[in-house]
Interface confidence: medium
C-alpha cells in the first residue's frame, strides 16, 4: 500500500535526521548542508 511505503520512508528520514543532529551537536561532526555538484 502506497501510504505504508510513504510512512516507512518518512520514518527512516526522521531517524536519519535525528542521527545527524546528534552527530552535529553531541559528537561535533559538522556536515555539509548541501550537496555539491561534481
Amino acid at each position: 500500500h502506497s501510504d505504508g511505503i510513504f510512512t516507512d520512508s518518512y520514518s527512516r528520514y526522521r531517524k536519519q535526521m535525528a542521527v545527524k543532529k546528534y552527530l552535529a551537536a553531541v559528537l561535533g561532526k559538522r556536515y555539509k548542508q548541501r550537496v555539491k555538484n561534481k
Partner: antibody
C-alpha cells in the same frame, strides 16, 4: 557571559605564539564550538577555525590556516597556537562562541557567532 | 571554500533613511547566513542569523532576506548609531571527513549616516 583573549603582543618573524581564550559566566556545552577569527588593521574579518566544545574536541580550519594554526581546549579555555608567523599575520585575534540553532524539519543545525571577546593584538615584526 | 562577496561599500544615507547591503555566495548556502555589526575598536556584534532571525535585543529596523546565493540586509529608519561596518557570514558546516571550513565572512560594507 563573556570571553577574553590573552597572549597577544610583539613576535619576531618566523616565531611562534599561543593565544588563550577564557570563558566566564558559562561552561562549554555539547552544542557549541569555540572559534578564532582575526582582523588585520583596517581590514575585514577572517575565519581561522573552530573546536567542538564537547568531548570529541573535533577541529575545523580554514584551508589557508591548516598546518600553521592549531586549536585546542580545556574545560574553560581555548588556545590558538600559531607557528611560522609573518608580517601578514599581524592582526587582532578574536575568539567567539559558535552556537547551534536547531531547525525543526531540517537535517542539520545552523550556527552563529553569538558571543565575542574584545580581541588581542598580535604584531609580527623584527 | 565558499567565497562571500559584499556590495556596495561604502553606502551612505540620511538619518531616517534606508540602506540595503548585498551579500553573494559563490554557491548556494541554503540560507545559513548571519549578519554582524562592527564599530571601531569593538568586536563584531551578531544582528541576524539563519538569514532573517533577529538576535535578541536587535531592533526590528534591521531586516534580513534572501536565499540560495543572494542575501540582503536592510536597515530602515537609520540612526547615527547605525554607522558601522556590516559583515555577512556563511555559517554552513564543515565536511564530516575533513578539517576545512566554510564559516567565511564577506569583505564588509561600511554604512555612513549623514
Amino acid at each position: 557571559q563573556s570571553l577574553e583573549e590573552s597572549g597577544g603582543g610583539l613576535v619576531q618573524p618566523e616565531g611562534s605564539l599561543t593565544l588563550t581564550c577564557t570563558a566566564s559566566g558559562f561552561s562549554f556545552n555539547s552544542s557549541s564550538y569555540m572559534c578564532w577569527v582575526r582582523q588585520a588593521p583596517g581590514k575585514g574579518l577572517e575565519w581561522i577555525g573552530c573546536i567542538f566544545t564537547g568531548s570529541s574536541g573535533n577541529t575545523y580550519y580554514a584551508t589557508w590556516a591548516q598546518g600553521r594554526f592549531t586549536i585546542s581546549k580545556t574545560s574553560t579555555t581555548v588556545t590558538l597556537e600559531m607557528t611560522s608567523l609573518t608580517a601578514a599575520d599581524t592582526a587582532t585575534y578574536f575568539c567567539a562562541r559558535d552556537r547551534a540553532y536547531f531547525l525543526v524539519g531540517y537535517f542539520y543545525a545552523t550556527y552563529y557567532f553569538d558571543l565575542w571577546g574584545p580581541g588581542t593584538l598580535v604584531t609580527v615584526s623584527s | 571554500d565558499v567565497v562571500m562577496t559584499q556590495t556596495p561599500s561604502p553606502v551612505s544615507a540620511q538619518v531616517g533613511g534606508t540602506v540595503t547591503i548585498n551579500c553573494q555566495a559563490s554557491e548556494s548556502i541554503d540560507s545559513d547566513l548571519s549578519w554582524y555589526q562592527q564599530k571601531p575598536g569593538q568586536p563584531p556584534k551578531l544582528l541576524i542569523y539563519r538569514t532573517f532571525t533577529l538576535e535578541s535585543g536587535v531592533p526590528s529596523r534591521f531586516k534580513g532576506s534572501g536565499s540560495g546565493t543572494d542575501y540582503t540586509l536592510t536597515i530602515s529608519d537609520l540612526e547615527c548609531a547605525d554607522a558601522a561596518i556590516y559583515y555577512c557570514q556563511c555559517t554552513d558546516g564543515s565536511s564530516i571527513s575533513g578539517s576545512y571550513g566554510w564559516d567565511a565572512f564577506g569583505g564588509g560594507t561600511e554604512v555612513v549616516v549623514k
